[in-house]
């Protein structure tokens, strides 16, 4: 039994960020005379939270009128709680003096702030990679409390297992951050694929937050090249076609070379998309056979997405006497990159 007891009935109070927190405190006696003050923390470094007599505490209001006669309720309400408000709050009775003397402290009420995690931000690799390569995606979310949190990765709805996740700091803090890295093996079919980082936390009431990244930002699908020649036309012109297929992204430059000299350069633009998200492009070159004495070496050179150029070359054999109109050509493959046309 004591002359004066300072009663803080709740050991802990949990409040959602943005809400108000009520910290309860009653005293068993108003004697001896002296103020009640609220502090966060204990010891010499404690922070004054509320003092009726002096100071400006815009977010703190007394629950009961402290100037009312016989008022023994010194509870306070703190508005617009943020994670920075977390801590243990003490209601302390002082005895009037010069200076006032601390008489009795309440047992303290621990205020924990339930703060929602920020929307997960997923970032992919800085440079694109091709199929069969592994790329890393990073997911970050900040500002949540309490520390317990669940993070999962999905690719096209399937959970990923090659994941490393850290929550910081390891010790006690007003709020926490999570960072997770997922490793994904790319396939040529991943242009339309998506990775999702899903964060579940007590503050989200079963409705997790999701961050997404499109593998289209991370993948490069190199093109296939095929060069073909149509029948020789009556005007001794040969129509040579360079088919560039199944590539992504669209950024592609095609150059025709005749005997090593640039004939024409084209940039791909506004191409229709294949079902799998890749693109196809066909370029034609008309070669006037009668204008050449010697064989013509044609090269289709493709530079895709800043990568080293890929070539397909073939030779057009210039005949001593002109072909009959409409005759077919026979092609013999003399190498992976060269075709001779007779």
């Amino acid at each position: 039994e004591e002359e004066l007891q300072v009663i803080q009935p709740e050991k802990s109070v949990s409040v959602a960020a943005g809400d108000s927190a009520t910290l309860n405190c009653t005293v068993s006696s108003l004697i001896p005379v002296g103020p009640i003050q609220w502090f966060r923390g204990a010891g010499p470094g404690r922070e004054l939270i509320y003092n009726l007599k002096e100071g400006h505490f815009p977010r703190v209001t007394p629950v009961s009128d402290p100037t009312k006669r016989n008022n023994m309720d010194f509870s306070i309400r703190i508005s617009n709680i943020t994670p920075a408000d977390a801590g243990t709050y003490y209601c302390v009775k002082f005895r009037k003096g010069s200076p006032d003397v601390e008489l009795k402290s309440g047992a303290g009420t621990e205020l924990s702030v339930r703060a929602k995690p920020s929307a997960p931000v997923v970032s992919g690799p800085a440079v694109r990679a091709t199929a069969e390569h592994t790329v890393s995606f990073t997911c970050e979310s900040h500002g949540f409390s309490p520390r317990d949190i669940t993070l999962k990765w999905f690719k096209n709805g399937n959970e990923l297992s090659d994941v490393q996740t850290n929550v910081d700091p390891a010790g006690k803090s007003v709020s926490y951050s999570i960072r997770s890295t997922a490793r994904v093996v790319l396939t040529r079919r991943d242009v339309h694929s998506q990775v999702i980082c899903e964060v579940a936390h007590v503050t989200l009431q079963g409705d997790p937050l999701r961050g997404t990244a499109n593998l289209s930002e991370a993948i490069r699908v190199p093109p296939f090249l095929e060069v073909t020649q149509q029948s020789m036309r009556a005007d001794n012109q040969v129509n040579v076609t360079c088919q560039v297929t199944k590539f992504y992204p669209q950024r592609l430059q095609l150059t025709w070379l005749e005997n090593g000299n640039v004939s024409r350069t084209e940039m791909a633009s506004a191409l229709p998309e294949n079902k799998d998200g890749t693109y196809n492009w066909t370029s034609w070159l008309l070669v006037n056979v009668s204008a050449h004495r010697d064989d013509v070496k044609l090269t289709c050179q493709v530079e895709h997405d800043g990568q080293p150029a890929v070539n397909k070359s073939f030779s057009v054999k210039v005949s001593a006497h002109p072909k009959e109109q409409g005759s077919n050509t026979a092609a013999e493959n003399t190498g992976t990159n060269e075709r001779n046309i007779y």
């Epitope: 004591e2 002359e3 108003l30 005379v33 402290p66 009312k68 006669r69 016989n70 008489l103």
Partner: antibody, heavy 114, light 111 residues
């Protein structure tokens, strides 16, 4: 129940030190303060001082230079020492519990006389 | 020091009548929304007995015939109706500022 009982010599010579004991029961001296109050014959009450539960003290400035209040919590006793007494210190001395003075001892009469 | 002046110094009242004692402080005894003024009854040969604390609160076991009022510097103790065993000295006391002080007392006699 709460009880306070003053004890000490009824007669003290001038210039000597008056020493009184207040023995308490029914409450803890760590949780409650104890006051000393005196009442000269036929006069009003005068507050001497208080020793708080934490053993800190507050005294009447008019007597402060001569007063010491202490306690032995384990024995449930509070002590008053008043030095350099004169006839003006003749009074009934009371101890009373806490800032509220809600319980009083019966008082002990001290006469200062040679 | 806060000086407490009680009036009247003495008062004779018939049983069943109202007795009113006033206590004026030389400065306010109010702090933190409360008046740190208390009233005691003392009968000859006995220690003071607490009646009222914080200006208007009745101590446990004290009859409701006793009441207190006032704030700041002016306080009143009322006994209504007075009974024969109310004959005693009545003291006001403040513990808002050191040194704690008592009024000079009011002697209530029953006619």
């Amino acid at each position: 129940q709460v009880q306070l009982q003053e004890s000490g010599p009824g007669l003290v010579k001038p210039s000597q030190t008056l020493s009184l004991t207040c023995t308490v029961s029914g409450f803890s001296l760590t949780g409650y303060g104890v006051n000393w109050i005196r009442q000269p014959p036929g006069k009003g009450l005068e507050w001497i001082g208080i020793i708080w539960g934490d053993a800190s003290t507050d005294y009447n400035a008019a007597l402060k230079s001569r007063v010491t209040i202490s306690k032995d919590t384990s024995k449930n006793q509070v002590f008053l020492k008043l030095s350099s007494v004169t006839a003006a210190d003749t009074a009934v001395y009371y101890c009373a519990r806490a800032g509220k003075m809600d319980y009083w001892g019966q008082g002990t009469t001290v006469t200062v006389s040679s | 020091d806060i000086v407490l002046t009680q009036s009247p110094a003495s008062l004779a009242v018939s049983p069943g009548q109202r007795a009113t004692i006033t206590c004026r402080a030389s400065e306010s005894v109010d702090s933190y929304g409360n008046s740190f003024m208390h009233w005691y009854q003392q009968k000859p040969g006995q220690p003071p007995k607490p009646l009222i604390y914080l200006a208007s609160n009745l101590e446990s076991g004290v009859p409701a015939r006793f009441s207190g009022s006032g704030s700041g510097t002016d306080f009143t103790l009322t006994i209504n109706p007075v009974e024969a065993n109310d004959a005693a000295n009545y003291y006001c006391q403040q513990n808002n500022e050191y040194p704690w002080t008592f009024g000079g007392g009011t002697k209530v006699e029953i006619k």
